[in-house]
């Protein structure tokens, strides 16, 4: 997150981190039920760990943290790497969470976001496009949903109904490492960090997010059948 601020501890209890090896964060994720996460489909890896209830970027133990393995990764069938359409994936964890003030699921919005809606995006991604700048703790950033027209003007030929744009204030944006993390609007999960221009946080090049209202049925059906 570029030019965000430290999230309040436990204010984003649905925020997850996907880790490679002992502690290499490569994507965010969102807890949507006691045993299921959502993340971006482009975050799919054969082996990874899941960390919930953690505030710091560092591997230091925190009392609220819970660690999991992914036992099933189900990318949307319409996703094709390295494209950006249908960029979501369900992850079933090896066990259910212990519900606590640090770890709680978020409800998915059934209605699509409208232009001007204020939302919160969060993550431990880079704080500039100079790739080694990471925050000490989870970052939060208020962003505004942009019109479809403005979104398409920003990225001609690249935007479809499975995406929405948000942000666009120069110097504020999601960035590398935030993928799969939550965009929460009015208390409900509206999107996932997906893509945007490189470097992040450029004028008229907003962040692009997976438009989850288009996938509510697929998410429910997939969870029920697995």
């Amino acid at each position: 997150i570029v030019n965000g601020s430290d999230c309040q501890k436990d204010a984003q209890p649905w925020q997850g981190a996907l880790l490679l090896g002992p502690n290499k964060l490569y994507c965010g994720a969102v807890l949507i039920s006691p045993q299921w996460l959502l993340t971006a489909a482009h975050c799919r890896k054969p082996v990874f760990r899941i960390r919930l209830g953690h505030h710091s970027m560092s591997p230091v133990y925190e009392s609220g943290q819970q660690m999991f393995q992914g036992i099933k990764s189900i990318p949307h069938p319409g996703y094709s790497h390295p494209g950006h359409s249908n960029d979501l994936m369900l992850i079933k964890m090896n066990r259910k969470i212990r519900d606590s003030h640090s770890v709680k699921p978020v409800e998915i919005a059934c209605d699509c976001a409208t232009e001007g809606t204020r939302c919160m995006v969060s993550g431990w991604g880079t704080t500039s496009s100079s790739h080694n700048n990471f925050p000490k703790v989870l970052q939060c950033l208020n962003i505004t949903v942009l019109s479809e027209e403005r979104c398409k003007n920003s990225y001609p030929g690249q935007i479809d109904k499975t995406m929405f744009c948000a942000g666009d204030e120069e110097g504020r944006d999601s960035c590398q490492g935030d993928s799969g993390g939550p965009v929460v609007c009015n208390g409900k999960l509206q999107g996932l960090v997906s893509w945007g221009d490189f470097p992040c946080a450029q004028r008229n090049r907003p962040g692009v997010y997976t438009n989850l209202c288009e996938f509510v049925k697929w998410i429910k059906d997939t969870m029920n059948s697995n």
Epitope: G21, H84, H131, S179, C200
Partner: antibody, heavy 126, light 107 residues
Framework: EVQLVESGGGLVQPGGSLRLSCAAS????????MNWVRQAPGKGLEWVSY????????DYADSVKGRFTISRDNAKNSLYLQMNSLRAEDTAVYYC???????????????????WGQGTTVTVSS | DIQMTQSPSSVSASVGDRVTITCRAS??????LAWYQQKPGKAPKLLIY???SLQSGVPSRFSGSGSGTDFTLTISSLQPEDFATYYC?????????FGGGTKVEIK
């Protein structure tokens, strides 16, 4: 079959210009970032330039900055390298290479170059 | 710029030998290192990405390890087709930089 084919190399005098082309086939070209990499005779690999899938981000090695220009035409599935003010030290085999990393995607994960052309030879000599 | 230093510059080995090549970055690059194989007159071929992930179609005798600044490519049992030059490359930070190469020759 996924393929990259370079063309446009040849013999040129110092100070001259050349335009290299790279024709891509067998994959969705506009989804991928691309690179030019060169190799001087008997030497190692040297990265020359990078262009993102939408051309919004471009970068160059210091050795070619201000002289070389990378570009792409996604409608034609083609990558280009315009080389001006050529010097003897630019003599090399030039490869185009597909980058597996999408700089647009906001994961923190980097791959490498998974598809390479056969190379085209540029000789700068008087 | 990040400098990549490979060692040794050449190694003589026999079929069946275990060969280890090292690559050192001048600053930490996490796990974002790729290894390539190049045979004379041919284009490089991606063997390993993210320091230890085997590219599709690459034999399992090739393996990579390391993180931060020190990385290793290992060929567990050298085969005749493995005699080539190997290069490391750091990929997270522009300008991308390659190591100087390690030539694996027949003893």
């Amino acid at each position: 079959e996924v393929q990259l084919v370079e063309s446009g190399g040849g013999l040129v005098q110092p100070g001259g210009s050349l335009r290299l082309s790279c024709a891509a086939s067998g994959f969705t070209f506009n989804d991928y970032s691309m690179n030019w990499v060169r190799q001087a005779p008997g030497k190692g690999l040297e990265w020359v330039s990078y262009i993102s899938s939408s051309s919004s981000y471009i970068d160059y090695a210091d050795s070619v900055k201000g002289r070389f220009t990378i570009s792409r035409d996604n409608a034609k599935n083609s990558l280009y390298l315009q080389m001006n003010s050529l010097r003897a030290e630019d003599t090399a085999v030039y490869y185009c290479a597909r980058d597996l990393t999408s700089m647009q995607s906001r994961d923190y994960y980097y791959y490498g170059m998974d598809v390479w052309g056969q190379g085209t030879t540029v000789t700068v000599s008087s | 710029d990040i400098q990549m230093t490979q060692s040794p510059s050449s190694v003589s080995a026999s079929v069946g030998d275990r060969v280890t090549i090292t690559c050192r970055a001048s600053q930490g690059i996490s796990s974002w290192l790729a290894w390539y194989q190049q045979k004379p007159g041919k284009a490089p071929k991606l063997l390993i990405y993210a320091a230890s992930s085997l590219q599709s179609g690459v034999p399992s005798r090739f393996s990579g390890s390391g993180s931060g600044t020190d990385f290793t490519l290992t060929i567990s049992s050298l085969q005749p087709e493995d005699f080539a030059t190997y290069y490391c490359q750091q990929v997270p930070i522009f300008p991308y930089t390659f190591g100087g190469g390690t030539k694996v020759e027949i003893k």
